[in-house]
């Protein structure tokens, strides 16, 4: 069998192949040892005793989408059956007190691999043998540990593969120089180690995206706005926009960054070297964000000028094909290429309530029955959008231990300006946060407030 | 360039079987899956199910399972689709689509199924 | 299977005009998200892949967007070229599934 034929996924175009795609990888052309790997198909009844207690769950992820050129990093991790765990040794242990279907195991190891290679005969001293080998015939590589290694990982996309020795979790990168651009399958096979043999444990599959286009995301943020995620923003206050650009593998690190924004308030087009900006719609209605960011990235060279045209006609080669990496002519030239990045959002703006101030506070005298408690009067004000709702937090004088929340809804004249009561037990220092609220605002004020002892004589203080 | 290029518009019995084929070029046929789509008159488009060229590796909708049958055959790059035990609601166009998600897309062939 | 919910069905509007087209999946899908265009007798062409990223040669005024369960199809300004029906796919899982389509009409 050839590698093809026991990864069921993409194969390369002979292009591919001669130049090498994915750096450290190989052609699944390759032959692949069956009698060592055995292959067996979805549905297989054998998959259901390829691990004791249960089956072996595989989880790939990758930081997909990668922009072509940058390296993209698979994981992938097993998850054991319950009660199981990878010791420090690299056996299969069960977790001691826990107790999953079949009870307490008597026995402490699922698989102990380590009393397996002890026993293992066959070798040459440098631990080489004719098992210890991938399903493509190299043999493991003798790092450190290696012996606590017993996962075998075949990772096949593009029709070539690369297998790892590892633990329960491991890590590929791959360079997306030459990756064809739009989702691609990376498809992960998982082999344990069975005597002087190898049995799958799992098999699993993931997306990954390759673009050409810078991968952004903005995020936005406004005082007193209710909902960040709703894309409705208050006229006249500041949005802080925040651009993340999604490149965990640093291929941007040494490029210069420009971000070319325009809000659709026709403010005109604002270009920056930073990736937040702050913007205040001054209009009401409807506008259109539109966000450019512009990278020179590391690229692949222009081809060189056509030679000469001879006199003779020559004989056409045929099309090219479709792949990218054809434009790359000398690998060791240092070439730059301008990538782009889009976000365009529909942004709303409506009236908020824009500011809210406590300009008077009353101590309300009450009749002699109630002597441990205070009412005092809030006299607020607000600018901006007519407040439906107010909140009042009361709580200790570090403002972070709630005592009390009081929510009530208000009926408040186009002034703006109302008066809240409320009751304190007790003297002492209190935090006040009050809360003026609409359908799309929030905004808050927040004062401490020394209530005396009940001697009519003491008067309110504000503390701060 | 890329090309897929269908075979021609079949008219067929309910009961028979359709065989539309698909032939690529302009790229390495097995580097990528193949998509067959198919599309009933004035409707939406239904996924049939892909093949891997390389080593007829072949995911079905599972509605189509029983009866469509996709092919590749690498010497002339070419894959198939074959519908078999057809009935009035067949009649579509069935469009072989290149990759995970289609880039590119054949032109169509009709199949008229009709008694 | 993973439903593809696409509205508006049909929509009229004017050259120039902004458009958008909004495809809600039964399930999480990820970004795993493509956009087609389908002119009458003629093949799907190919817009967006990954929820928001362009095919090489489909003009910027097309955008998408979306993550999760909600995606759309953004035209900013329409040209008449655009008038056609436009579906989304889902490719997350099997079997991949296309919403209804829309129809974007001349008004």
């Known amino acids: 069998k050839r590698f093809h034929d026991v990864l069921g996924n993409e194969r390369p175009s002979a292009y591919m192949r001669e130049h090498n795609q994915l750096n450290g990888w190989s052609s699944d052309e390759n032959d692949w040892n069956e009698k060592l790997y055995p292959v067996w198909k979805r549905g297989d009844m054998r998959w259901k005793n390829s691990w004791k207690g249960g089956r072996v769950q595989a989880v790939l992820t990758s930081d997909s989408p990668a922009l072509v050129g940058s390296n993209i990093t698979f994981a992938v991790n097993l998850i054991f059956p319950r009660c199981q765990k990878e010791d420090a040794n690299g056996n299969i242990v069960y977790e001691k007190n826990c107790r999953n279907e079949a009870g307490l195991s008597a026995d402490p190891y699922v698989y102990n691999w380590t009393a397996w290679s002890e026993d293992s005969d066959g070798e040459n001293g440098t631990g080489q043998s004719h098992h210890n080998v991938f399903p493509d015939g190299k043999p493991f590589p003798h790092h450190p540990g290696w012996r606590r290694w017993n996962f075998i990982y075949v990772f096949h996309t593009l029709g070539q593969y690369f297998q790892k020795l590892g633990r329960c979790s491991v890590r590929v990168s791959v360079n997306t120089a030459n990756v064809t651009l739009g989702p691609q399958l990376m498809e992960v096979t998982v082999y344990r180690r069975h005597g002087r043999a190898y049995v799958p444990i799992a098999q699993v599959k993931d997306v990954y995206v390759v673009t050409d286009q810078i991968p952004v995301f903005v995020t936005m943020f406004q005082k007193n706005d209710r909902n960040s995620s709703d894309e409705t923003f208050l006229k006249d206050l500041p949005i802080m926009f925040d651009v993340l650009i999604h490149d965990p593998s640093h291929f941007l690190n040494y490029s210069t960054i420009n971000y070319k924004w325009s809000f659709g308030d026709n403010t005109g087009l604002f270009v920056s070297t930073n990736h937040t900006v702050n913007h205040t719609y001054v209009l009401n209605g409807t506008f259109s964000l539109n966000l450019t960011v512009k990278a020179a990235a590391p690229g692949p060279c222009p081809p060189p000028p056509p030679p000469p045209r001879p006199s003779k006609p020559t004989p056409s080669l045929g099309p090219a094909g479709d792949n990218p990496l054809e434009l790359s002519r000398i690998p060791d030239e240092n070439c730059q290429i301008n990538r782009y990045g889009h976000f365009q959002a529909t942004i709303t703006i409506v009236e908020g309530i824009l500011e809210v101030n406590i300009i008077q506070m009353t101590d309300v005298l009450m009749p002699v029955p109630w002597p441990e408690s205070s009412l005092i009067d809030f006299v607020v004000t607000c600018q901006g959008s007519i407040p439906t709702e107010v909140c009042t937090i009361i709580s200790d004088p570090t403002c972070e231990i709630t005592q009390n929340t009081v929510c009530s809804p208000v009926d408040v004249d186009e002034m703006c300006l109302l008066t809240v009561r409320r009751t304190f037990n007790g003297s002492g220092t209190y935090c006040v946060n009050l809360t003026l609220g609409d359908d799309t605002s929030l905004a808050l004020t927040s004062t401490l407030i020394s209530v005396p002892d009940r001697d009519p004589a003491s008067p309110l203080r504000m503390a701060n | 360039q890329v090309q897929l290029v269908q075979s021609g518009a079949e008219v067929k019995k309910p009961g028979a079987s359709v065989k539309v084929s698909c032939k690529a070029s302009?790229?390495?046929?097995?580097?990528?899956?193949m998509n067959w789509v198919r599309q009933a008159p004035g409707q939406g488009l239904e996924w049939i199910g892909a093949i891997n060229p390389s080593n007829d590796y072949t995911e079905y909708n599972q509605k189509f399972k029983d009866r469509a049958t996709m092919t590749a055959d690498t010497s002339t790059s070419t894959v198939y689709m074959e519908l078999s035990s057809l009935r009035s609601e067949d009649t579509a166009v069935y469009y072989c689509?290149?990759?995970?998600?289609?880039?590119?897309w054949g032109q169509g062939t009709t199949v008229t199924v009709s008694s | 299977d993973i439903q593809m919910t696409q509205s508006p069905s049909s929509l009229s509007a004017s050259v120039g005009d902004r458009v958008t087209i909004t495809c809600k999946a039964s399930q999480n899908v990820d970004n795993h998200v493509a956009w087609f265009q389908q002119k009458p007798g003629k093949a799907p062409k190919a817009l967006i892949y990954?929820?928001?990223y362009r095919y090489s040669g489909v003009p910027d005024r097309f955008s998408g967007s979306g993550s999760g369960t909600d995606f759309t199809l953004t035209i900013s300004s329409l040209q008449p070229e655009d008038f056609a029906t436009y579906f989304c796919q889902q490719y997350k899982s099997y079997p991949f599934t296309f919403g209804g389509g829309t129809k974007l009409e001349i008004k």
């Open positions: 990954s929820a928001s």
């Open positions: 689509g290149r990759s995970y998600s289609p880039d590119y």
């Open positions: 302009g790229y390495t046929f097995t580097t990528y899956w």
